[in-house]
């Protein structure tokens, strides 16, 4: 008997310091390049080894980035979102949404799965 798959959504503020090759993650998404169906949000596609995000440890592949330094990322073209990150300065505050897959088994077993949805 298969359990139902649910998602636990949490938000977190992450402060990163820019390294020699940026903040240490790649993004996908935007109004012109939807990564998730019917969602033009900006998502983390890759965390770079030894980059700022990896060293901090909180940002995960599949996370949705809601804002950069308080600036909302809703309804942005992909390149406009990229430019926000490029020009965000040395100390960068990210508001991110983690989406954890939770398996509700027949006896209530809960296990975390792939957050990338």
């Amino acid at each position: 008997m298969n359990g139902r798959v649910d998602y636990l959504v949490t938000e977190e503020e992450i402060n990163l310091t820019r390294g020699p090759s940026g903040l240490g993650f790649n993004i996908v998404g935007g109004t012109d390049q939807q990564y998730v169906s019917n969602d033009s949000g900006i998502y983390v596609s890759r965390i770079k080894e030894n980059g700022a995000a990896a060293l901090d440890g909180r940002l995960q592949e599949g996370d949705k980035i809601l804002s950069v330094n308080g600036q909302d990322l809703k309804n942005l073209l992909h390149q406009d979102a990229v430019d926000l990150f490029r020009n965000a300065g040395y100390a960068v505050s990210l508001r991110v949404q983690h989406r954890l897959q939770v398996q509700n088994g027949p006896i209530g077993h809960r296990g975390e799965g792939d957050p990338s949805g």
Partner: nanobody, 126 residues
Framework: DVQLVESGGGLVQPGGSLRLSCAAS????????IGWFRQAPGKEREGVSC???????YYADSVKGRFTISRDNVKNTLYLQMNSLKPEDTALYYC????????????????????WGQGTQVTVSE
């Protein structure tokens, strides 16, 4: 320090082939969306071919079926195999990477990339 160094350009006859290389140092190539760009004298720079960190590829219409982009993660090197070369392929060829975008089409169409090589000249002529 992040560095990209191109090589492999030269003079070739129409119909000939070349393989360009772009050696990366200071970062791991497969963590980045990266691509090949070219600029001919008096013309705007154009994206030729780009590849995302996950391996998705984009080719400009003018090179589809003739050029192939690839990456050797062990050698930390990007390649561009150029076949059936035409005089209009004559240009200075650069590789460039984006620190943020992982969308190969956007990278190839971008004016705002973060790391550039110095370029290697390709001349296609009799």
């Amino acid at each position: 320090d992040v560095q990209l160094v191109e090589s492999g350009g030269g003079l070739v006859q129409p119909g000939g082939s070349l393989r360009l290389s772009c050696a990366a140092s200071g970062f791991t190539l497969d963590d980045y969306a990266i691509g090949w760009f070219r600029q001919a004298p008096g013309k705007e720079r154009e994206g030729v071919s780009c590849i995302s960190s996950h391996g998705s590829t984009y080719y400009a219409d003018s090179v589809k079926g003739r050029f192939t982009i690839s990456r050797d993660n062990v050698k930390n090197t990007l390649y561009l195999q150029m076949n059936s070369l035409k005089p209009e392929d004559t240009a200075l060829y650069y590789c460039a990477a984006s620190y943020y975008s992982d969308y190969e089409v956007a990278v190839c169409r971008s004016d705002a990339l973060d790391a550039w090589g110095q370029g290697t000249q390709v001349t296609v002529s009799e």
